[in-house]
C-alpha cells in the first residue's frame, strides 16, 4: 500500500530572466527513493538517481542546474517556461509518486511564491 505524500512548492511565480528552484519532498513512507525524474508536460528535464547522480536533458543543459538536493534549479526563465512541472519519485517497494508544480513566469517584478501544498 502506498502511504506516502509529496509536498511541493505548489503554485509559484518568478520573473522573466530570473531563476527558480523546483522542489518536492516525499514523506509518510519508509520506501527507498531510487530516483526522481523532473518533467515538464511531455518533456524530460532531468533525472536524479540517488546513487548514480544526475542526467540533464541536452535541450535544457544550459538552463537547468541540479539541486539543491533532489530539486532542480531553472535559470534564465522565459515566458515560455510557464506551465506544469512534475517531480516523479521512483521508490522501492512502493512504486511511483508524482508531485505537481505550476510555474508562472511574469514580465514584471510582481512575482512571488505561492503556498506549499500536498498531493497524496
Amino acid at each position: 500500500m502506498m502511504t506516502g505524500t509529496i509536498e511541493t512548492t505548489g503554485n509559484i511565480s518568478a520573473e522573466k530572466g530570473g531563476s527558480i528552484i523546483l522542489q518536492c519532498h516525499l514523506s509518510s513512507t519508509t520506501a527507498q527513493v531510487t530516483q526522481v525524474n523532473w518533467e515538464q508536460q511531455d518533456q524530460l528535464l532531468a533525472i536524479c538517481n540517488a546513487d548514480l547522480g544526475w542526467h540533464i536533458s541536452p535541450s535544457f543543459k544550459d538552463r537547468v542546474a541540479p539541486g539543491p538536493g533532489l530539486g532542480l534549479t531553472l535559470q534564465s526563465l522565459t515566458v515560455n517556461d510557464t506551465g506544469e512541472y512534475f517531480c516523479i519519485y521512483h521508490t522501492y517497494p512502493d512504486g511511483t509518486y508524482t508531485g505537481r508544480i505550476f510555474l508562472e513566469v511574469l514580465e514584471s517584478s510582481v512575482a512571488e511564491h505561492g503556498a506549499r501544498f500536498q498531493i497524496p
Partner: antibody, heavy 119, light 107 residues
Framework: QVQLVQSGAEVKKPGASVKVSCKAS????????MHWVRQAPGQRLEWIGG????????SYNQQFKGRATLTVDTSASTAYMELSSLRSEDTAVYYC????????????WGQGTTVTVSS | DIQMTQSPSSLSASVGDRVTITCKAS??????LAWYQQKPGKAPKLLIY???YRYTGVPSRFSGSGSGTDFTFTISSLQPEDIATYYC?????????FGGGTKLEIK
C-alpha cells in the same frame, strides 16, 4: 584519450566467483559513473548495475542484486565487478562502460572480458 | 522493468539505401533513449543520445527521432562499414534495459 582496459578472460566452475577489473585513464575517474553490462552469446545487452566513484553509491539490476558486487579503487582509477554463485547462464562477455558527464548514455566501453562457466 | 522491442531483428539492404530501425518501449521513457552500434567481437559504440542527438564524431548519415514509447533510428545512405548490430537503450528508470538488437547486412 579516454580508455577503459579490462582484465583477461576467465574460466570458472559453477558455484565459483569471478572478479573482473576495469582500469580507466584519460579522464577524471570520479566524475563519471561506471556501469557493467553483459552479453551472453547471441543475446541482448543486459545492464548489471552502476557505481558512482565519487561516493561509492551503487545501483543494481534486481536480477543481480546479492550476486553482483560493484566496487572502485579511486586511487588506482579502477572499477571492479564481482559475480558470485556462478552458473552456466552467466557465460557471457562482461563490459565496463562509463556514463557521460551529467548524462546517462554510455559513451566509452572497455574491450570486454569473456567469462566462461563450465564444469 | 521497461521492455524495449526492436524491429526488425535483422535487415538486408544495399549500399546507398535508407535504413530505418524502430524501438518501442513498454512505457513512456520521454527522450531517455540511446542507440549503439556493435560490430562482431567488439564493444558497442554510442551513436545517438537523448533520442535525437548525434554523438561526437558520428557521421551525419546516422539520426534518431521519437519520444515517449516510439523511437526511430535511421541511416540515410547505407555504407559498407555500417554492417553491424544496432541496439536501443532506455535510461529513464533503473534497471536500464536494451532492445534485442537489429542485425544489419548488405544485400
Amino acid at each position: 584519450q579516454v580508455q577503459l582496459v579490462q582484465s583477461g578472460a576467465e574460466v570458472k566452475k559453477p558455484g565459483a566467483s569471478v572478479k573482473v577489473s576495469c582500469k580507466a585513464s584519460g579522464y577524471t575517474f570520479t566524475e563519471n559513473a561506471m556501469h557493467w553490462v553483459r552479453q551472453a552469446p547471441g543475446q541482448r545487452l543486459e545492464w548489471i548495475g552502476g557505481i558512482n566513484p565519487n561516493n561509492g553509491g551503487t545501483s543494481y539490476n534486481q536480477q543481480f542484486k546479492g550476486r553482483a558486487t560493484l566496487t572502485v579503487d579511486t586511487s588506482a582509477s579502477t572499477a571492479y565487478m564481482e559475480l558470485s554463485s556462478l552458473r552456466s547462464e552467466d557465460t557471457a562477455v562482461y563490459y565496463c562502460t562509463r556514463s557521460s558527464y551529467y548524462r546517462y548514455d554510455l559513451d566509452y566501453w572497455g574491450q570486454g572480458t569473456t567469462v566462461t562457466v563450465s564444469s | 522493468d521497461i521492455q524495449m522491442t526492436q524491429s526488425p531483428s535483422s535487415l538486408s539492404a544495399s549500399v546507398g539505401d535508407r535504413v530505418t530501425i524502430t524501438c518501442k518501449a513498454s512505457q513512456d521513457v520521454k527522450t531517455a533513449l540511446a542507440w549503439y552500434q556493435q560490430k562482431p567481437g567488439k564493444a558497442p559504440k554510442l551513436l545517438i543520445y537523448s533520442a535525437s542527438y548525434r554523438y561526437t564524431g558520428v557521421p551525419s548519415r546516422f539520426s534518431g527521432s521519437g519520444s515517449g514509447t516510439d523511437f526511430t533510428f535511421t541511416i540515410s545512405s547505407l555504407q559498407p562499414e555500417d554492417i553491424a548490430t544496432y541496439y536501443c537503450h532506455q535510461h529513464y528508470t533503473t534497471p536500464w534495459t536494451f532492445g534485442g538488437g537489429t542485425k544489419l547486412e548488405i544485400k
